[in-house]
Amino acid sequence: AGVFELQIHSFGPGPGPGAPRSPCSARLPCRLFFRVCLKPGLSEEAAESPCALGAALSARGPVYTEQPGAPAPDLPLPDGLLQVPFRDAWPGTFSFIIETWREELGDQIGGPAWSLLARVAGRRRLAAGGPWARDIQRAGAWELRFSYRARCEPPAVGTACTRLCRPRSAPSRCGPGLRPCAPLEDECEAPLVCRAGCSPEHGFCEQPGECRCLEGWTGPLCTVPVSTSSCLSPRGPSSATTGCLVPGPGPCDGNPCANGGSCSETPRSFECTCPRGFYGLRCEVSGVTCADGPCFNGGLCVGGADPDSAYICHCPPGFQGSNCEKRVDRCSLQPCRNGGLCLDLGHALRCRCRAGFAGPRCEHDLDDCAGRACANGGTCVEGGGAHRCSCALGFGGRDCRERADPCAARPCAHGGRCYAHFSGLVCACAPGYMGARCEF
């Protein structure tokens, strides 16, 4: 658990010609407020989709009235930080949307009116607990300067806020693999992560990144049961016991591999890795020369002119083993980036790229937004090989050219007035009525 914090430093006209003087006027004083929306991962920044990591709304800034003839200043901002609490792990990569809203304080009937001045969106990598990151974003003629950070709430620590620091009475008694938490010397930090994939039921670790097995289990991730046999005995010292685990006759017991071969268990049986000059299921076939053609799959045989000298197989790409008998699954190395599909064609690897990506390993991200424009303050968002527009409130359609009026359906009952708002619509009720839709 933790908090994402956003500090707005300035909002005002950007550099260059055509910059607006001010969003407010002498006739219509106004004040600003901000909304931030966070989503995990490098997702599309559509404001309409849920802010899965959270959202926050700032307080209203000071009232500003434009002074005729005065140079355009940075606009007065609300006090304080925008804080977005997150309950689970901090994802490390996230998308944000920051909206700047104007609240006009003129003589509107039914109260103030809101309108979206600017929306900026971006994708960032950020470790929790790090320093403030500074950013400048431009939206049309406006420029927004801000800083942000993610911090963990105690007892969580770490770059993802997934490790727990617990109060300790004796800081020097932190156990193996633990260290005191900075800056509080009376806490111990516990790394909570064993080796990835380590069995939750049958594994444990003493140091981060390792996987050791409980009784009766084996394998690098403790997922392979050791053969069991009951050792109940009707008499003698073990009669008081309820039974125990002893390794049963495993397939590699007594080493079935001849001629110095090494045995490894497989889910169904065993496999022998034979030294050079021997082959067969149990390495029992010997005296092989290059004349016997021991190299499979087009391997090139070198040496081994007589049975006493060893031969060497030089394997073609895609094969390995002392006799080139094993196919290499080159796709297991996941060479295709950005979600590309790997195809091992034997002679070559192919990557079938997702829309929006190209290159032999799908390493090039095509700019879907190049040359595209979104109308009415919309922001172009890459993704899926096609551009799409994240529209400002009140607009919709592929390029944000269509009007979308949430008040068109006249949702406010009993003569209430409807106003478009960043989170939907707001009803200003006639005297004597109340409720979100003036229904009471």
């Epitope: 516990a190 790394p191 064993c194 670790c205």
Partner: nanobody, 123 residues
């Protein structure tokens, strides 16, 4: 605050038995697994035995077949039954716990430690 208190140590002849207990209190989160460690003078602390939330156990090679770890969840107490004791079992024995919000992964290194109880095995 988590409190782990060991008891049951003492002086015993080689071949004898002892039963160590560890009373646990004050857990904020789930008590996912409990361990016994030991440390002989001038040596590194070593893991003796472990029991996880579902009852799975681990024993160091040097004690397997002689020591038995168990726990009583109702009493929040961990035990180590030590039989056929040898002089090389002489050490300070520590109880340690790993607690987390959910016991959803493998047992990670301990988060909490007791003060220890001395076991001395004479020949």
């Amino acid at each position: 605050q988590v409190h782990l208190v060991e008891s049951g140590g003492g002086l015993v002849q080689a071949g004898g038995s002892l039963r160590l207990s560890c009373a646990a209190s004050g857990f904020t989160y789930s008590n996912c697994c409990m361990r016994w460690y030991r440390q002989a003078p001038g040596k590194a602390r070593e893991l003796v035995s472990l029991i996880n939330s579902s009852g799975g156990t681990y024993y160091a090679d040097s004690v397997r077949g002689r020591f038995t770890i168990s726990k009583d969840n109702a009493k929040n107490t961990l035990y180590l039954q030590m039989n056929s004791l040898k002089p090389e079992d002489t050490a300070m024995y520590y109880c340690a716990a790993y607690q987390a919000k959910y016991c959803s992964g493998p047992c990670a290194p301990p988060t909490d430690w007791g003060q220890g109880t001395q076991v001395t095995v004479s020949s």
